[in-house]
Interface confidence: low
Amino acid sequence: GYKAEVMVSQVYSGSLRVLNRHFSQDLTRRESSAFRSETAKAQKMLKELITSTRLGTYYNSSSVYSFGEGPLTCFFWFILQIPEHRRLMLSPEVVQALLVEELLSTVNSSAAVPYRAEYEVDPEGLVILEASVKDIAALNSTLGCYRYSYVGQGQVLRLKGPDHLASSCLWHLQGPKDLMLKLRLEWTLAECRDRLAMYDVAGPLEKRLITSVYGCSRQEPVVEVLASGAIMAVVWKKGLHSYYDPFVLSVQPVVFQACEVNLTLDNRLDSQGVLSTPYFPSYYSPQTHCSWHLTVPSLDYGLALWFDAYALRRQKYDLPCTQGQWTIQNRRLCGLRILQPYAERIPVVATAGITINFTSQISLTGPGVRVHYGLYNQSDPCPGEFLCSVNGLCVPACDGVKDCPNGLDERNCVCRATFQCKEDSTCISLPKVCDGQPDCLNGSDEEQCQEGVPCGTFTFQCEDRSCVKKPNPQCDGRPDCRDGSDEEHCDCGLQGPSSRIVGGAVSSEGEWPWQASLQVRGRHICGGALIADRWVITAAHCFQEDSMASTVLWTVFLGKVWQNSRWPGEVSFKVSRLLLHPYHEEDSHDYDVALLQLDHPVVRSAAVRPVCLPARSHFFEPGLHCWITGWGALREGGPISNALQKVDVQLIPQDLCSEVYRYQVTPRMLCAGYRKGKKDACQGDSGGPLVCKALSGRWFLAGLVSWGLGCGRPNYFGVYTRITGVISWIQQVVT
């Protein structure tokens, strides 16, 4: 029997250039008579053009929704009703070719062609893109608040904020023909629920979305987005009602930046330079293609690429890479944004060098990618350390912490977190090394204590990059480094002349002179520790709530002991900068550290002094008794303490704690407490210091109060941010 043919709606979006008309400002106002008149004529022309081709039989509807420069550009959409079996045959490319063919066939014709009655359409200026009914609905929802802006070369145009009576607005942006648009978004409120989407075309086509951002992102307070060319659309969707714009948008045209380079590396190890996508840290543009060729001086070396918060992964099947495609020596890899460092190590087998290609495979892009490159020794990639094959990083081996996700850095250890005697592989505890007393059979623990040694897990690295064997030599009053750098920056960690945390006791004035109280509107929220004249360290989770993210809210008190009264040694500061660790992850508590820059430097006194920061190699031995201090609750669920409490806690081996917390303990965490419970940090202690006393009498910051199950519960230790795990970031910021 006869079966009716199934018809489907195919939606196209596009633009065409009219050579005999000029754009005027009147055409940006949809309510103007000029706009109404021009759209009527343009719509008629568009319909006539489509129906002049063999697409005419499928024509359903069309609309010209906007105009732009060039001399006059019309932006439109149209719908064809196509038999289902023909759907794939009428791709945007085919439709564009049919329309261009029609335009070219009439260019030199003297015959009367309806669509040429008023408009001279440029065949080369026609663009047809795939769209959907959903895209048209999204476009229509913005037409009540539609803004067109042309931005000229050398201009930076600040866009007018959205109309808050509308629920959605669209900025249609256009720049000079051979340039690309760069949009800058700056969030200006601490919290909002607004949504912004940026498109690589004039309208909100889902398939041409560059990126979308939501709700006054604190992770990215400023976002810069690059289009692939001179056209871009930004769509705003209203969040909570607000009389203030929660963001500022500005746009500028920029020239295309070549992304090709030939480099020859020097005969030395470590980082030698940086490769990055154009206009880094701007988002890379939808049609980015970079090609970097690096030549290695010798086959002894491999090439290392060190990424920050970005990793390369093998993509199963041939799915497109959504966060950038990489080809390295004919291997296809996909980029993936992660909250961790990562290194890709490329073995070199030929002197021809290595070509690295980066391509944005889809229109959806992301933050610009930057990579440090350098060489590594192929026969010994990680001198004194362990090469973690999972992430390409060199990590400490056999230190009691599984730094590598697969834990292989802690496998096959003869001596874990101890020193291995040369003569018989006996293990001795680290504080016994270079302490002047031989503990190994032939005294190998006391050898090479006055000279440089190869760098390793527990060696201290001096400023001149040489290493010393003595563990924890910092600020012990004896220079161990040739350059004396182990005794520099030692004005720290000394208690003032002075003599609740769960299970604690009251502290006296000056006993913990680095202790900070972080307050909002006179209320103690978190603890912290003074680490330098203008820097206080605390936990990132103290700023987790959007309402706590603004620096203006916070006051930092130093030298404080009692919450309900002040004494002469107490000083207060406003916060000029708040920096959360870039890898901080709220859900996992990983990298739970933040730095507050004070509005003016501290004046040191008996009651206000910084704590000492440990080197990355500093070893805090499990079993060591250390101290936590704070004004937190004295019992689970209780109110905060009026007096600064102190309590001793024992450092717990990482694997034991990891098991208690079902493997949620990362290498950036350290556990302390007692299986008995009782002595622990509690709510309000967050961000406060866990300090351990060195033999020199100086106190070193081992951890920051981070998380735990309840307070003082048996079998559940307190979990602290491990300072040695985040020290490189701290030093980078503070110095």
Partner: antibody, heavy 118, light 107 residues
Framework: QVQLVQSGAEVKKPGASVKVSCKAS????????MHWVRQAPGQRLEWMGR????????TYSPKFQGRVTIIPDTSANTAYMELSSLRSEDTAVYYC???????????WGQGTLVTVSS | DIQMTQSPKSLSASVGDRVTITCRAS??????LAWYQQKPGQSPKLLIY???TRHSGVPSRFSGSGSGTDFTLTISSLQPEDFATYYC?????????FGQGTKLEIK
């Protein structure tokens, strides 16, 4: 210095109970766990249970649960272990020991021989 | 309960020898393992805890290693006072359990 001094040897009949004391000096028992471990002749050491004298919280080995009771007297800095329903296989040397929270038992008493015989 | 198995059950050695005693746990005890020395008629003395940490006053010839389920006590050079019975104990979870002991005798 740290010392744990236990009460003297005891001879008991089957079905009876025995109570052994352990007096601490050189430290405060409230800061430690106090454990009881026994060793039958020629046998391995066997952990019986522990108490946290600070709050009286006890943990017993399932093998002795219901028969053993450990109690502290913090004013006398002494811990006691009582074992009831004695049988001949309870003949052993009973030791008290202390530990700091997670760590194992670092100091032990001299032991008390309990003989169960009809 | 976690079972602790020591080997050998007994061993003969001479003064100056290097001696190794092993202990295996029936399940992972991380590094929560202790070694004790016991002489006839005396109470046990703690030698090593947390698998590798020597108790205060313990000579450096005693060392411990291992983690997870397999552990080793090494006496690098036997002295006359070292002949005794050695026990391992897991201090990972209650009920705490001991190995059956290794008797170290003079050859």
């Amino acid at each position: 210095q740290v010392q744990l001094v236990q009460s003297g040897a005891e001879v008991k009949k089957p079905g009876a109970s025995v109570k052994v004391s352990c007096k601490a000096s050189g430290f405060n028992i409230e800061d430690y766990y106090m454990h009881w471990v026994r060793q039958a002749p020629g046998q391995r050491l066997e952990w019986m249970g522990r108490i946290d004298p600070e709050d009286g919280e006890t943990t017993y080995s399932p093998k002795f649960q219901g028969r053993v009771t450990i109690i502290p007297d913090t004013s006398a800095n002494t811990a006691y272990m009582e074992l009831s329903s004695l049988r001949s296989e309870d003949t052993a040397v009973y030791y008290c020991a202390r530990s700091i929270y997670l760590d194992p038992m670092d100091y032990w008493g001299q032991g008390t021989l309990v003989t169960v015989s009809s | 309960d976690i079972q602790m198995t020591q080997s050998p059950k007994s061993l003969s050695a001479s003064v100056g020898d290097r001696v190794t005693i092993t202990c295996r746990a029936s399940q992972d005890v991380t590094t929560a393992l202790a070694w004790y020395q016991q002489k006839p008629g005396q109470s046990p003395k703690l030698l090593i805890y947390w698998a590798t940490t020597r108790h205060s006053g313990v000579p450096s010839r005693f060392s411990g290693s291992g983690s997870g389920t397999d552990f080793t006590l090494t006496i690098s050079s036997l002295q006359p006072e070292d002949f005794a019975t050695y026990y391992c104990q897991q201090h990972y979870s209650t009920p705490y359990t001991f190995g059956q002991g290794t008797k170290l005798e003079i050859k």
